[in-house]
């Protein structure tokens, strides 16, 4: 229904706290370099304005769209051009082009320092002094680094953050309480960020239909007892919600997400038997809980998929007359039977089925042509199953760090032109798949592995798109979203690559490495490993193992030495010489 004042409507629906949080996220995602203080000033102005519109919907400017109101606020910022360059050109445009322009200027890799968590004591002090400001900083810092973070979910993580601090700041050993809990929130949030970026990429590159297909498969796996019409309704709503968030309509997105949660809880009987526990929670937790809900039990009496999709005489007629409904039904039926498959795999199977019908239906004897289609799925299913098996075996053998290194070598060989920091980030994230998925029960491994890898590879594609350097990466990234992971897996050593010259300074280290946290130490070593592979793309596993082992010993030895600086200065050149020799 149309409202006189959109902003008043959203303020009333969301409440002041969530309204302010969402406006802060929106501004932080659009203008990623502005300091918190500047954004919070704008947030307060927008909130005050919203309140005047709540009091009187006919007040001046209250009838303007939220994009217009937000855009006008952003464009009024002094020195916008000085800080943001060509983003300021967006301000010359009218809506909706102005918002589109802002979206295009979102930076997936902003030049911001890594978010440093303060010491436990300092954290607790500033949290207790002003919890609102503390959590505001959290929203701001995460949102500006992740300009596509799913806004209502970020509010949920801020709430989690709040809970952890409230609980731990009263403990005697604050750090012991805070560290593991905040690490867990951070890990979940980072995974959420790459997953949401993939959803926005899907929406941006392939449109709503592609996203809706993803949603149908996912919902069908989770709610196998729901009718196709119910799944379609849920998928349509989820598509709308994600489109809004990806498009910067954060207030509408959060409002619609809350509405969907309400609908699901009011219609549990036709959706799933597993929803009740979620439905007793407050709105943010409720939506999050529903998004993470375990799969319902598959109905016991499901007939063979072949009946309606191979054996039925009307297959081709049904396909030609309403592809969306017929193929949507196929995807639904196949997905509800296979919670053990990844969504990517299910979409590949649906695509194969569609391609087979498109090829066969105009022929003289269509059933003879498409009759073996389900058997032809076998290689498509085996490929990711083998991927999971071999990678989980390797992970179990090497552990997370060793597995990350194996992945780093593999990907540096596939795409040596890609910058080392990007390769290291990608490999570290890809390598975490082991810890995340390989410990799960067999039936959950494949969906966990492949859908996680797809999200990480999407991040690689997004970064590569900004500065394309590898034809192979461009090729894999410009194809269909569901084919990306198999495309990357199939890449081999890039034979066209001219090895990098050996630069001694790349492998020169100083005593500062000794005081780095373990994670930073690992990154230093992995950076050196990627550079070694770029220097010798065809180095054997044994050669790399020797050099890296030597390197680890060298760091260990010098960090234990009385005169660390001297040790690094004298032993470093020896290490470089030995490494060159080992790789010759």
């Amino acid at each position: 229904e149309a409202h006189k004042s959109e902003i008043a409507h959203r303020f009333k629906d969301l409440g002041e706290q969530h309204f302010k949080g969402l406006v802060l996220i929106a501004f932080s995602q659009y203008l990623q370099k502005c300091p918190y203080e500047e954004h919070i000033k704008l947030v307060q102005e927008v909130t005050d304005f919203a309140k005047t519109c709540v009091a009187d919907e006919n007040a001046e400017n209250c009838d303007k769209s939220i994009h217009t109101l937000f855009g006008d606020k952003l464009c009024a910022i002094p020195k916008l051009r000085d800080n943001y360059g060509e983003l300021a050109d967006c301000c010359a445009k009218q809506e909706p082009e102005r918002n589109e322009c802002f979206l295009q200027h979102k930076d997936d890799n902003p030049n911001l320092p890594p978010f440093q968590r303060p010491e436990a004591e300092a954290m607790c002090t500033s949290f207790q002094e002003n919890p609102t400001s503390f959590l505001g900083h959290y929203l701001h810092e995460v949102a500006r680094r992740h300009p596509y973070f799913y806004a209502p979910e970020l509010l949920y993580y801020a709430e989690k953050y709040n809970e952890v601090l409230t609980q731990c700041c009263t403990e005697s050993d604050k750090a012991a309480c805070l560290t593991p809990k905040l690490d867990a929130v951070k890990e979940k949030a980072l995974v959420a960020a790459v997953r949401q970026r993939m959803k926005c990429s899907s929406m941006q590159r392939f449109g709503e239909r592609a996203f809706k297909a993803w949603a149908v498969a996912r919902m069908s796996q989770r709610f196998p007892n729901a009718e196709f019409a119910e799944i379609t309704k849920l998928a349509t709503d989820v598509t709308k919600i994600n489109k809004e968030c990806c498009h910067g309509d954060l207030l509408e997105c959060a409002d619609d997400r809350a509405e969907l949660a309400k609908y699901m809880c009011e219609n549990q009987a036709t959706i799933s038997s597993k929803l009740q526990a979620c439905c007793d929670k407050p709105v943010l937790q409720k939506s999050q809980c529903l998004a993470e809900i375990e799969h319902d039990n598959i109905p016991a009496d499901l007939p063979s998929i072949a009946a309606d999709f191979v054996e039925d005489k009307e297959v081709c007629k049904n396909y030609a007359e309403a592809k969306d409904v017929f193929l949507g039904t196929f995807l639904y039926e196949y997905s509800r039977r296979h919670p053990d498959y990844s969504v990517s795999l299910l979409l590949r199977l649906a695509k194969k089925y569609e391609a087979t019908l498109e090829k066969c239906c105009a022929e003289g004897d269509p059933p003879a042509c498409y009759g073996t289609v389900l058997a032809e799925f076998q290689p498509l299913v085996e490929e990711p199953k083998n991927l999971v098996k071999t990678n989980c075996e390797l992970y179990e053998k090497l552990g997370e760090y060793g597995f990350q290194n194996a992945v780093l070598v593999r990907y540096t060989q596939k795409a040596p032109q890609v910058s080392t920091p990007t390769l290291v980030e990608a490999a570290r994230n890809l390598g975490r798949v082991g810890t995340k998925c390989c410990t799960l029960p067999e039936a959950q491994r494949l969906p966990c592995v492949e859908d996680y890898l797809s999200a990480i590879l999407n991040r690689l594609c997004v970064l590569h798109e900004k500065t394309p350097v590898s034809e192979k990466v461009t090729k894999c990234c410009s194809g269909s979203l569901v084919e990306r992971r198999p495309c990357f897996s199939a890449l081999t050593v890039d034979e066209t690559y001219v090895p990098k010259e050996f630069k001694a300074e790349t492998f020169t280290f100083h005593s500062d490495i000794c005081t780095l946290p373990d994670k930073e130490k690992q990154i230093k070593k992995q950076t050196a490993l990627a550079e070694l592979v770029k220097h010798k793309p065809k180095a054997t596993e044994d050669q790399l193992k020797t050099v890296m082992g030597d390197f680890a010993q060298f760091v260990d030895k010098c960090c234990k030495a009385a005169d660390k600086d001297n040790c690094f200065a004298t032993e470093g050149p020896n290490l470089v010489a030995r490494s060159k020799e080992a790789l010759a």
Epitope: L357, E358, G364
Partner: antibody, heavy 118, light 110 residues
């Protein structure tokens, strides 16, 4: 491989008319054939398709007045209740092999002109 | 019913120049089921491009198709006199019954 339309002529409104598409060098049991028309000085308009299996589909606007059939080695387009708006050159065209529902027509006849006038 | 809207029409270009023709679809075409045809007076149309960007064999690489979803473009670079013709886009949709063509764009070469 070629297609050729025939049967186009001047008819009065309301008269039924059947056009024929004769194929040579093409095995109709393997290909889909479409009918497309073009009013003088206007754009192309898809009428319908017959698959190799004999299954037919029509444009929403063409359902009921147009019938596509395949008596033997020809493909016919039967038209009823003709009006002056049906005046056009009628083409038959083959769908690119390997496609069933896509608008990819790689082989066309030269067309036959149908004039509906009183 | 599906609609394909072509712009501009007519369009003129000098020999050696570049011509861009747009084709907007409502709703989205199905699975990039979009084609481009060239038609010269008194002749049937000729298929140039299918699946939005794939060139039919024998068609010069000066013809390039791009786009997806609802927005598609045919670009003719290094225009020749023989390229003077009317160009049509054709779209396939969820229902085969919605198959349709754009209104056509006449290209005049000077």
């Amino acid at each position: 491989q070629s297609l050729e339309e025939s049967g186009g002529r001047l008819v009065t409104p309301g008269t039924p008319l059947t056009l024929t598409c004769t194929v040579s060098g093409i095995d109709l049991s393997n290909y889909a054939i479409n009918w497309v028309r073009q009013a003088p000085g206007k754009g192309l308009e898809w009428i319908g398709i017959i698959w190799a299996s004999g299954t037919t589909f029509y444009a929403t606007w063409a359902k009921g007045r147009f019938t596509i059939s395949r008596p033997s080695t020809t493909v016919d387009l039967e038209m009823t209740s003709l009006t002056t708006a049906d005046t056009a050159t009628y083409f038959c065209a083959r769908t690119v092999p390997g496609y069933s529902t896509a608008p990819y027509f790689d082989l066309w006849g030269p067309g036959t002109l149908v004039t509906v006038s009183s | 019913a599906a609609v394909l809207t072509q712009t501009p029409s007519p369009v003129s270009a000098a020999v050696g120049g570049t011509v861009t023709i747009n084709c907007q679809s409502s709703p989205s075409v199905w699975s990039n089921f979009l084609s481009w045809y060239q038609q010269k007076p008194g002749q049937p149309p000729k298929l140039l491009i299918y699946e939005a960007s794939k060139l039919t064999s024998g068609v010069p690489s000066r013809f390039k198709g791009s786009g997806s979803g609802t927005q598609f473009t045919l670009t003719i670079s290094d225009v020749q006199c023989g390229d003077a013709a009317t160009y049509y886009c054709g779209g396939g949709y969820s229902s085969i019954s919605d198959t349709t063509f754009g209104g056509g764009t006449k290209v005049v070469v000077k």
